[in-house]
C-alpha cells in the first residue's frame, strides 16, 4: 500500500547554474494524497533558513505529482545560495533537502558596473 505521507522530492546536493537577468523557476516536487499541504520556500543563511516573504510562488499540478514553484523574474546576483522547501501537513513539518543556485553575472565590467558589482564582482 502506497504511503500517504507528504513527500518532497528534492535530491540531496542538487544544484542549478543560472544566469542573472533571465527568469528561472525553482521547483519543489510535492507528493500528497487528499489535501494539498501548505508549502513554503526559505533561503539558507548559515544554519537558519529565512522564509521567503514577498516572493512570487505558484502550483503546477500534474497527474502523479505537484510542483510548488518559486519564481525568479529575473534572477539577481543576490539570489545565489541554497534553498529549501517545507510542507506543513497535519501539524507535521516536512523539510526538503537543500538545492543550490549558482548565479553568474552576465554584465561585463564595461557595462556600467554598480557599486555593489564593484565591491563583489563574482557570485559564482
Amino acid at each position: 500500500k502506497e504511503s500517504c505521507d507528504v513527500q518532497l522530492y528534492i535530491k540531496r546536493q542538487s544544484e542549478h547554474r543560472i544566469l542573472a537577468g533571465d527568469p528561472f523557476e525553482l521547483e519543489c516536487p510535492v507528493k500528497y494524497c487528499a489535501n494539498r499541504p501548505h508549502v513554503t520556500w526559505c533561503k539558507l543563511n548559515g544554519t537558519t533558513c529565512v522564509k521567503l516573504e514577498d516572493r512570487q510562488t505558484s502550483w503546477k499540478e500534474e497527474k502523479n505529482i505537484s510542483f510548488f514553484i518559486l519564481h525568479f523574474e529575473p534572477v539577481l546576483p543576490n539570489d545565489n545560495g541554497s534553498y529549501r522547501c517545507s510542507a506543513n501537513f497535519q501539524s507535521n513539518l516536512i523539510e526538503s533537502h537543500s538545492t543550490t543556485l549558482y548565479v553568474t553575472d552576465v554584465k561585463s565590467a564595461s557595462e556600467r558596473p554598480s557599486k555593489d558589482e564593484m565591491a563583489s564582482r563574482f557570485w559564482a
Epitope: 537577468g21 533571465d22 514577498d54 516572493r55 543576490n78 552576465v106 554584465k107 561585463s108 554598480s114 555593489d116
Partner: antibody, heavy 120, light 106 residues
C-alpha cells in the same frame, strides 16, 4: 549611449492588430531585457510584458491572450504584436530597458513612446 | 494582482516646503520604485528599490518604507519638482504602477 525608439502605425481600426517595433542602441538584447509599457488616460501606466535576454517572455495576464513579444538580436529590435484592438487600447506605447543590480531589478531607460489611436 | 494606491492624487506645495507622498500596496512587496513624469515626456527613473536615488536626482529627494507602505519625500520643494510621480512594484506579476501623485507648485 543607451537609446530605445518605438515605431508604430499611429492609427489602427477596431478589431485589427497592432505591430510596434522597438529599435535599441547602446546595449545588447542578449544582456538586457526589454519591456513594453503603455499609458492611457483611463488606465494610467500598465506593464504589458517583457522579452528577457535569453529569449523567454513574460506577460501581464490580463491582456496576455492578445499579446505577442518577439525579438531579433542581430538587428537589435524587439517587436510587440497585439490582436483584436478596441478603443480602450488607445494609448502611448513605450519600450523600456530592464536592468538588475545586486539585489533589485528595475526599468531604467525609456523610449520616447509611440502614440496609438484605435478608431474607425 | 497587487494594487498600488497613491495619495494624495494632487498635491500643491510652496517653494521651500517639505513634501511627502505615499504609496500603499494591497499586498507586501520587497521594495518600491518611483518614476517622475512631466507633460509630453516619458517617465524617468527617480528612486530605485525604495531609497536609492537615480542618477542626477537632487539630494533633497528621499524614499522610505517597507511591506505595504512607502513614501517619497522632498525636503524643500523647488519649481522644477512639479511633475507626476508614480510608484511601481516589481515583486509580483503583473508588475503594477500606482495611479500617480501630481505635484504642483503654489
Amino acid at each position: 549611449q543607451v537609446q530605445l525608439k518605438e515605431s508604430g502605425p499611429g492609427l489602427v481600426a477596431p478589431s485589427q492588430s497592432l505591430s510596434i517595433t522597438c529599435t535599441v542602441s547602446g546595449f545588447s538584447l542578449t544582456t538586457y531585457g526589454v519591456h513594453w509599457v503603455r499609458q492611457s488616460p483611463g488606465k494610467g501606466l500598465e506593464w504589458l510584458g517583457v522579452m528577457w535576454p535569453g529569449g523567454r517572455t513574460s506577460y501581464n495576464p490580463a491582456p496576455m491572450s492578445r499579446l505577442s513579444i518577439s525579438k531579433d538580436n542581430s538587428k537589435s529590435q524587439v517587436f510587440l504584436k497585439m490582436n483584436s484592438l478596441q478603443t480602450d487600447d488607445t494609448a502611448m506605447y513605450y519600450c523600456v530597458r530592464g536592468d538588475y543590480e545586486y539585489d533589485y531589478y528595475a526599468m531604467d531607460y525609456w523610449g520616447q513612446g509611440t502614440s496609438v489611436t484605435v478608431s474607425s | 494582482q497587487i494594487v498600488l494606491s497613491q495619495s494624495p492624487a494632487i498635491l500643491s506645495a510652496s517653494p521651500g516646503e517639505k513634501v511627502t507622498m505615499t504609496c500603499r500596496a494591497s499586498s507586501s512587496v520587497s521594495y518600491m520604485h518611483w518614476y517622475q513624469q512631466k507633460p509630453g515626456s516619458s517617465p524617468k527613473p527617480w528612486i530605485y528599490a525604495t531609497s536609492n536615488l537615480a542618477s542626477g536626482v537632487p539630494a533633497r529627494f528621499s524614499g522610505s518604507g517597507s511591506g505595504t507602505s512607502y513614501s517619497l519625500t522632498i525636503s524643500r520643494m523647488e519649481a522644477e519638482d512639479a511633475a507626476t510621480y508614480y510608484c511601481h512594484q516589481w515583486s509580483s506579476n503583473p508588475y503594477t504602477f500606482g495611479g500617480g501623485t501630481k505635484l504642483e507648485i503654489k
